[in-house]
Structure formats: C-alpha cells, structure tokens
C-alpha cells in the first residue's frame, strides 16, 4: 500500500464508522457499479506501524456491506488504513481504501429505548449493553428529549460509571391526557452532527388525582 | 511530495472576522484530518482543534470555542479556520498539519495574522 | 488540561558534542491502547515545525540516527549524540494521547 497516493478523489464506495449498541461498525456503499459484488474482503494495516494488510476474519468473503470491527480496532487514537475488496465469483471487481481515526470519524447511534406513560410522568428505560469497553465510551453524554405542543425539553442525565446495562429516566413533572414524545441520542463532547433516534410517544392517562413520582435525576 | 499551501499573510482591523486556507496536495486529501495549531511568542504553540477531512467532524480545544471555526471543501482538498471577533491576541502566525490518527507529521508554512487599527 | 514541561529553556553546545532534553507532562501519557503518544518536534529559524519523533522513540523518515527518544509515563528525554550545525532551532514535545493536545514551552538549541 501507498499511505501517500497522489490526490485522486474518484472513490468508488463510500464509508461511515459508527458505533451501534457501544460496536464499532463499519458500513459501506458503492458508487457506479454496473456489477455488483457477489462477496466483499476487509483488509486493515495501522499507520503508525504499517505491516501487511490484515484480512478481518468475520469480514473475510462477506456477503454483508457492513463489519464489526470492535475486537479488531481498539485504540482511538491509530489511523487504520482500510482497503475493501469486491469480489464476484471469483474475479476481484474492485478495491477500495480508506483510513479511519476513530476519535473523529465515528459518528453515534442512538441507543434503543422504551417509554411507558403514567399519569404525570415517563419512564424512559434505555438499553445498553451489559459491558462497554473503556475506549468505546468516547466521552459520551446521554441526552433524552421531551416534546410536547411544539415545546422541546432537553434531559441530560448523569450516569455514574459506564454506559452499561439497562438505564431508566423518569421524566416528571407532566399534564395528564396530554401527547408527549420522547427521543434519545448519544452527545459527543464537540458540537459533532448528532443522530436522533426517532420518536416514540404516548398519550398520557387522564388524572384521576396528583401523583408524585420520585425523579431519578 | 506531501505539500500543505496556507493562504497568505492577513491584516486585519480589530472586531472582524479572518478565514484562512490550508490546501493538502500530494496524498489523498481526505484520507488525513487537518489539525490548526497557534503559534505566539508569548504562549508557544496552542493546539486550536481538528476536522476529519471525510466526514467534516471536529474537535476543539475548549478555550478556541467561539473564536475558531474549521470547515473543509473535499473538492478542492482545502481546510479553513475562520477566527472571531479578532484581537491584539490573534496576532500570531497560524499552522496547519495533517495527521493520520493522533499523529501529526507534515505542517503547512503558516499564516501570519496582523491585527491593527 | 495536560501541562508539558520542557528544560532547559535554552541549550548551548559545541558542534560534534552531545545534547540532551527533558520533556515531563503532568499525567500519564500511556494510552489504554498501549502506546505513548509523545512526539517531538523541531522548528528551525524562519521555518515551520517539522516531525522529529513520534511514539516516543521511532524516528520520522529522513531524521539522523544520532536523534534518539526514549521515556514512559510522564518522563521523556531526546538526546541528539553529536550535535551538528543543522540542529539549531528549537525542539518542542506534544502530547496527542489526551484532547486536547498540548505542547511543550520549547527548548532553544544554540551552537556554541
């Protein structure tokens, strides 16, 4: 490999690295394929000791456009020199490569979630993995968001230790019979683009009396 | 070779706002992220922040947020940073350098920012 | 943030004689990924700063043989075994294991 190709741009796929459930990703697109590959091959070397490219073992003849790279890529600070293979039957169609920091170039998927409505209050139970490795934390803030009429609350809930295992956030303080949407995502330290993760609502019940709910905040 | 062509010197009245260029030349642009970093007599060199050149995601040093902003154009392999609101203070020369991960290994010449009345 | 401290301020040696500067940064620079992200760095007069070592010890392509680094933790030292007329400048470490990045005051190398 050459870590320093002149600059051509023409790239036939397109990349993203995200992290998904606290695993790191790595998705691709091809661009002007009038053939498309029957099966893919990862290969990776790191920049700073650039050896022979590496073939990812579960992402050898892969016919998925995605690879889990969480065991394989664990420091945040390397540039992994990428190169994706594109195979059908036997010939090779295409190559492709890229280098990864994951410090930057990781972009965050919003965490699944439930709601469950009461009368004057949300219980918003967010789902983690039950072990999150220490450089997949990445200075991550969990932020749940409440609209209601058109008005938009942000919670940003302190979570002691690790974002691992199962998390629940009671928003209160809420008007019975009323509509209330929640969505929640993950918030890099940097004003980085954030992903939101769609809305779930609920219609609250109607009150019969004032119930107090203990605040988890 | 390797190359990163900064803009050349700039001088500017207090108050308003200067954006420099930094063009990589001689590698594939976006396959590095380009770094800013500040350098004064007073403080040597201050590290202002990073962008990935592929996905246009930054990090900044808290104490440039709201006086640096780092964009970058794929298509004509060029980083910028504009400054805020200039002061004596930003009288200094401007570096960029690429990095492939946390390494920084090839700088630009640098910009000369002058700010006067 | 990380606080990188160089001596000494100014170094004055005879060509052909041996140099040595210290680098101490204020928190552990061992990375949870195993490596050391010291990097040293020499700017000449006029110039831009140009990489001299990086990972504490491996030397950038085209960096003399008589530039060594070595160190771990928070105690760094480059030593240049005999200094020749290009050496002149000043020397600056970095630290990219924490954001933000931090650098050195700098170390002035003058030919005696």
């Known amino acids: 490999i050459s870590y320093d190709s002149p600059d051509y741009t023409d790239e036939s796929c397109t990349f993203k690295i995200s992290l998904r459930n606290f695993r790191s990703i790595l998705s691709w697109e091809l661009k002007n394929h009038s053939i498309v590959p029957t099966h893919y091959t990862l290969l990776y070397t790191i920049m700073s000791k650039p050896e022979d490219l590496k073939v990812v073992k579960n992402c050898a003849n892969t016919t998925r456009s995605f690879c889990d790279l969480t065991d394989e890529w664990r420091s945040t600070h390397e540039a992994y020199v990428t190169v994706l293979e594109g195979f059908s039957g036997n010939t090779t169609l295409f190559s492709c490569s890229h280098n990864f920091w994951l410090a930057i170039d990781m972009s965050f998927e919003p965490p699944e979630f439930e709601i469950v409505g009461f009368t004057n209050h949300i219980n918003v139970m967010v789902k983690f993995p039950s072990i999150v490795e220490e450089e997949l934390q990445f200075d991550l803030s969990l932020v749940i968001e409440e609209q209601s009429e058109g008005i938009v609350k942000k919670h940003k809930p302190e979570i002691k230790g690790n974002m691992s295992g199962n998390f629940t956030y009671i928003i209160d303080k809420l008007i019975p019979n009323t509509n209330y949407c929640v969505s929640v995502y993950l918030e890099h330290s940097d004003e980085q683009a954030v992903i939101k993760s769609p809305l779930k609502c609920t219609l609250l019940p109607p009150g019969q009396e004032s119930e107090s709910a203990e605040s988890a905040k | 070779q390797v190359q990163l062509q900064q803009s050349g010197p700039e001088l500017v009245r207090p108050g308003v706002s200067v954006k420099i260029s930094c063009k990589g030349s001689?590698?594939?642009?976006?396959?590095?992220?380009i770094h800013w970093v500040k350098q004064s007599h007073a403080k040597s060199l201050e590290w202002i922040g990073v962008?990935?050149?592929?996905?246009?995601?930054?990090r900044y040093n808290q104490k440039f947020k709201g006086k640096a902003t780092m964009t970058v154009d794929k298509s004509s392999s060029t980083a910028y940073m504009e400054l805020a609101s200039l002061t004596s203070e930003d009288s200094v020369i401007y570096y960029c350098?690429?990095?492939?991960?946390?390494?920084?290994?090839?700088w630009g010449q640098g910009t000369s920012v002058t700010v006067s009345s | 943030d990380i606080v990188m401290t160089q001596t000494p301020l100014t170094l004055s040696v005879t060509i052909g004689q041996p140099a040595s500067i210290s680098c101490k940064s204020s928190?552990?620079?061992?990375?949870?990924?195993?490596?050391?992200?010291l990097n040293w760095l020499l700017q000449r007069p006029g110039q831009s700063p140009k990489r001299l070592i990086y990972?504490?010890?491996k030397l950038d392509s085209g960096v003399p043989d008589r530039f060594t680094g070595s160190g771990s933790g928070t105690d760094f030292t480059l030593k240049i075994s005999r200094v020749e007329a290009e050496d002149l400048g000043v020397y600056y470490c970095?630290?990219?294991?924490?954001?933000?990045?931090?650098f050195g005051g700098g170390t002035k190398l003058e030919i005696k």
């Open positions: 928190q552990s620079l061992l990375d949870s990924d195993g490596k050391t992200y």
């Open positions: 962008i990935s050149t592929y996905y246009g995601n930054t």
């Open positions: 350098a690429r990095s492939g991960g946390s390494l920084m290994d090839y």
């Open positions: 001689g590698y594939r642009f976006t396959d590095y992220a």
């Open positions: 990972l504490v010890s």
């Open positions: 970095w630290q990219g294991t924490h954001f933000p990045y931090t």
